[in-house]
Interface confidence: low
C-alpha cells in the first residue's frame, strides 16, 4: 500500500575537523521510494556538487573535505508524493585546530607611546591566546593586556617592554604558536646634565660639559650663538646608552652655547637642548667681534610693538639681518597663536624687542638688553602659565618649529634698571600697572647671578622654539 | 645646469603604494628645500610635501598626513615621496621642485620654487 | 589653511594688452608670495617672488605688487608665449597654498 514518508533517525550535530570528511545520515520508510533533497543555510545542495557525496537514494549526504565554511544548518526533505513532505534538520560544526591568520610583526615604538602588536586567530573552539615575553608567560596588568581580537596592547610603553614576544593560540584540538618577533623601544633624546653658565676673565679656558641619554643613542652638537662652534675641541664618550661630551673653549668674547642632543626615529628626530651663557667679567660694551649695525626698523611683524621709526640692531652675522630676524620673529609669533589675550601681547612686545634690539649708534654700535624688570614681568606677571607649557612644550619636543635657537633672554642675566638706568631698555608696549614691577626687590648686588626667588626651575630657561617634530 | 628628474609613477590600484624618486643634478639638495607640489587632471596645484634635506625638517599638507613620507638621501642628491594607502583622489602629476636656501632656517618665508621636474603621473584606479 | 582667491580665473586678452591678475590672501601673508606661468603638459615656471622681485630670465613686462593682503601680476603688453595658466602661491604659513589659476587665452 503507499505509504507516506517518515524520517526514521532524524539528523544530528555533526562535528567534524576541517579537511576530514562529515556525514548525515536521513534515514526514510515509504512506499513509493521518495525523492529526497538536501539544503544547507535553505540553500539546494546540487547533485552534481563535487564537493558532496549523496548516497543510498539520498539517505546518506557526505561531505568530502570539509572547510570552515561548511559550517551551518543541514536538513533533508522526502517527498514521494503520498501525503506532505518530510525535513530533518542537524548542525554541521566545524571543529578547527588553531591558526594564527594575523601574526604579530616587529614593531618600534617611541617610550610613552601605546603599542599594538597583532594576534588574530581562527579555530573552533574559539581558541584562547597568551603571550610569551622571553622565556616565560606574560602577566597583565594596569598597562599590558590581551584584547579580545588577542592582540596585545601596551600602554605607556616602557624600556623593560623592550624584548621578544610570541602569542599562543590554544583550544581543545591544538596549539598554535607565533613567530618571535621583536619590540624595540625608542625613547627620545633627553638632557641629563646640562652645561653651567660661567662669568670668566678674558683668555679664560672653560669646559662645557654636557650629558644625554635617549634610544637610540643622541649626538650632541654645540651651537655658539645660534652657529655651529666654529672653534674649541669637543671630547665624546658613550657608555650605557649616555653620551658624554665637553666642550673646551678659550673666552675672548661673551656667547650663548647650546647643547642639542638629537636622535632619530624612522624619518623624524627628537631633540633636547640647554644652554650656558659664558660672560666676560668687566665686559661693558661689545668689542669689535660684535658685527652689526643701527638701523631704522622696515620690517612687518613688529610694527605695532617698535616704536615708530625705532632705531635696531641688526647683526651682520646673517647674510641678510632684516629678513632673518624678521623671520625669527615671525616663527616665534605663529607659535603664540595660541596664547592667552594677556600675554600675548606681552610675549610679542618681549620678542621683538630680544630680536630686534634697541641699538646704541657709535664707533661700535651697541645692543641694548631688555631691563630684567621688564622680562620678569613677562615671564610670571603675564605669561606664567603659559610660559611653563613652553618650557614643557620645548622639553617633550612638541614644536614643530625647525628652529635651532629662538629665545628670550634668560632673565636673571639681564641688567636691572636699579643699576644703570641707561644700560637696559624698557618695553614701551607692555601696559602693566607700574605696581608690579615693585613686586621685584630691587637690585643691590653687582652680582649678576643673583636670582629673583621662585623663577620656574628648568635646565635652560629659554624661552625657545624647539627644532623638533611631533612624532604623530 | 640645474636639473629636477622626477620618476615613479604609474597605476595603482586604491589602498596600494608608489615611491616617486626626484633626482636632482646641478646643485646640492642639501643647499635647499624639496617640495612635491601635485595637479589633478584638469586642475590647480596643490602642494603636498618639503623637506629641508640640511636638518631633515618635513611638513606635509592636511590631505596626505600620515599617508605620504617625504625623505632625501644626499649621498645620491636625490629625494623621495613615499605614498601608502593612495586614493582615486590622489591622481594626479607630481612634480618635485627646489627652492635655493643659503640660509640653514625653516621654510617659512621663502622666495618661491625656482627649478621644477618634468612631472610624473599616477593613477589611482581599481 | 590660508585661502588665495585668485580674479578672475579666464580671460581673454590680445596681444599688445595690458593684463591684470589679482590674488587676495584670507590673511596677512607679509610679501611671502610667488607666481608662475603653467602651459598645457608643463611644469610650473617662477615668474615673481616676495610679491614684487622678478626672478631671473623673466622679462621685464612681467610685474609683481602688494597692498595689504591683495597681491596683483600685471603683464605690460601681452605677448603671444604668455598664452597661459598663471598661479600665485603664498609661502608664509603653513601649508603653502595656490590659488586656483587664471587661463589667459587668446581673444
Known amino acids: 500500500l503507499p505509504k507516506a514518508p517518515v524520517i526514521t533517525t532524524p539528523l544530528e550535530t555533526v562535528d567534524a575537523l576541517v579537511e576530514e570528511v562529515a556525514t548525515f545520515m536521513c534515514a526514510v520508510e515509504s512506499y513509493p521510494q521518495p525523492e529526497i533533497s538536501w539544503t544547507r543555510n535553505k540553500i539546494l545542495i546540487k547533485l552534481f556538487d563535487t564537493r558532496y557525496s549523496i548516497r543510498e537514494n539520498g539517505q546518506l549526504l557526505t561531505i568530502l573535505s570539509v572547510e570552515d565554511s561548511d559550517d551551518g544548518i543541514y536538513c533533508c526533505t522526502a517527498n514521494n508524493g503520498v501525503g506532505g513532505a518530510v525535513e530533518s534538520c542537524g548542525a554541521l560544526q566545524v571543529k578547527m585546530k588553531p591558526k594564527i591568520t594575523r601574526p604579530p610583526i616587529n614593531v618600534k615604538i617611541i617610550e610613552g607611546l601605546k603599542a599594538v602588536l597583532p594576534c588574530t586567530t581562527m579555530g573552533n573552539p574559539k581558541p584562547s591566546v597568551s603571550w610569551i615575553k622571553g622565556d616565560s608567560p606574560l602577566r597583565e596588568n594596569s598597562r599590558i593586556a590581551v584584547l579580545e581580537s588577542g592582540s596585545l596592547r601596551i600602554h605607556n610603553v616602557q624600556k623593560e617592554d623592550a624584548g621578544q614576544y610570541r602569542c599562543v593560540a590554544k583550544n581543545s584540538l591544538g596549539t598554535a604558536y607565533s613567530k618571535v618577533v621583536k619590540l624595540e623601544v625608542e625613547v627620545f633624546a633627553r638632557i641629563l646634565r646640562a652645561p653651567e653658565s660661567h662669568n670668566v676673565t678674558f683668555g679664560s679656558f672653560v669646559t662645557l660639559h654636557c650629558t644625554a641619554t635617549g634610544i637610540p643613542v643622541p649626538t650632541i652638537t654645540w651651537i655658539e650663538n645660534g652657529n655651529a662652534v666654529s672653534s674649541g675641541s669637543i671630547q665624546e664618550s658613550v657608555k650605557d646608552r649616555v653620551i658624554d661630551s665637553r666642550l673646551q673653549l678659550f673666552i675672548t668674547k661673551p656667547g650663548l652655547y647650546t647643547c642639542i642632543a638629537t636622535n632619530k626615529h624612522g624619518e623624524k628626530f627628537s631633540t633636547a637642548k640647554a644652554a650656558a651663557t659664558i660672560s666676560i667679567a668687566e665686559w661693558s660694551k661689545p668689542q669689535k667681534d660684535n658685527k652689526g649695525y643701527c638701523a631704522q626698523y622696515r620690517g612687518e611683524v613688529c610694527n605695532a610693538v617698535l616704536a615708530k621709526d625705532a632705531l635696531v640692531f641688526l647683526n651682520t652675522s646673517y647674510a641678510d639681518p632684516e629678513e632673518a630676524q624678521e623671520l625669527l620673529v615671525h616663527t616665534a609669533w605663529n607659535e603664540l597663536k595660541v596664547v592667552s589675550p594677556v600675554c600675548r601681547p606681552a610675549a610679542e612686545a618681549l620678542l621683538c624687542n630680544h630680536i630686534f634690539q634697541e641699538c646704541s649708534p657709535g664707533v661700535v654700535p651697541t645692543p641694548i638688553p631688555i631691563c630684567r624688570e621688564y622680562c620678569l614681568a613677562v615671564k610670571e606677571l603675564f605669561c606664567a602659565k603659559e610660559w611653563l607649557v613652553m618650557e614643557e612644550k620645548t622639553h617633550r619636543g612638541l614644536y614643530r618649529s625647525e628652529m635651532h635657537l629662538l629665545s628670550v633672554p634668560e632673565c636673571s642675566k639681564l641688567p636691572s634698571m636699579h643699576w644703570d638706568p641707561t644700560a637696559c631698555a624698557r618695553l614701551p608696549h607692555l601696559d602693566y600697572n607700574k605696581e608690579n614691577l615693585k613686586t621685584f626687590p630691587p637690585m643691590t648686588s653687582s652680582k649678576p647671578s643673583v636670582d629673583i626667588p621662585n623663577l620656574p626651575s628648568s635646565s635652560s630657561s629659554s624661552f625657545s622654539v624647539s627644532p623638533t617634530y611631533s612624532m604623530t | 645646469e640645474v636639473q629636477l628628474v622626477e620618476s615613479g609613477g604609474g597605476l595603482v590600484q586604491p589602498g596600494g603604494s608608489l615611491r616617486l624618486s626626484c633626482a636632482a643634478s646641478g646643485f646640492t639638495i642639501s643647499s635647499s628645500s624639496i617640495h612635491w607640489v601635485r595637479q589633478a587632471p584638469g586642475k590647480g596645484l596643490e602642494w603636498v610635501a618639503s623637506i629641508s634635506s640640511s636638518s631633515g625638517y618635513t611638513s606635509y599638507a592636511d590631505s596626505v598626513k600620515g599617508r605620504f613620507t617625504i625623505s632625501a638621501d644626499t649621498s645620491k642628491n636625490t629625494a623621495y615621496l613615499q605614498m601608502n594607502s593612495l586614493r582615486a583622489e590622489d591622481t594626479a602629476v607630481y612634480y618635485c621642485?627646489?627652492?635655493?636656501?643659503?640660509?640653514?632656517?625653516?621654510?617659512?618665508?621663502?622666495?618661491?620654487?625656482?627649478?621644477w621636474g618634468q612631472g610624473t603621473l599616477v593613477t589611482v584606479s581599481s | 589653511d590660508i585661502q588665495m582667491t585668485q580674479s578672475p580665473s579666464s580671460l581673454s586678452a590680445s596681444v599688445g594688452d595690458r593684463v591684470t591678475i589679482t590674488c587676495r590672501a584670507s590673511?596677512?601673508?607679509?610679501?611671502?608670495v610667488a607666481w608662475y606661468q603653467q602651459k598645457p603638459g608643463k611644469a610650473p615656471k617662477l615668474l615673481i617672488y616676495s610679491a614684487s622681485s622678478l626672478y631671473s630670465g623673466v622679462p621685464s613686462r612681467f610685474s609683481g605688487s602688494r597692498s595689504g593682503t591683495d597681491f596683483t601680476l600685471t603683464i605690460s603688453s601681452l605677448q603671444p608665449e604668455d598664452f597661459a595658466t598663471y598661479y600665485c602661491q603664498q609661502s608664509y604659513w603653513w601649508p603653502i597654498t595656490f590659488g586656483q589659476g587664471t587661463k589667459v587665452e587668446i581673444k
Open positions: 590673511q596677512s601673508v607679509s610679501s611671502a
Open positions: 621642485a627646489r627652492k635655493y636656501s643659503k640660509r640653514a632656517y625653516p621654510d617659512y618665508y621663502w622666495r618661491g620654487l625656482d627649478y
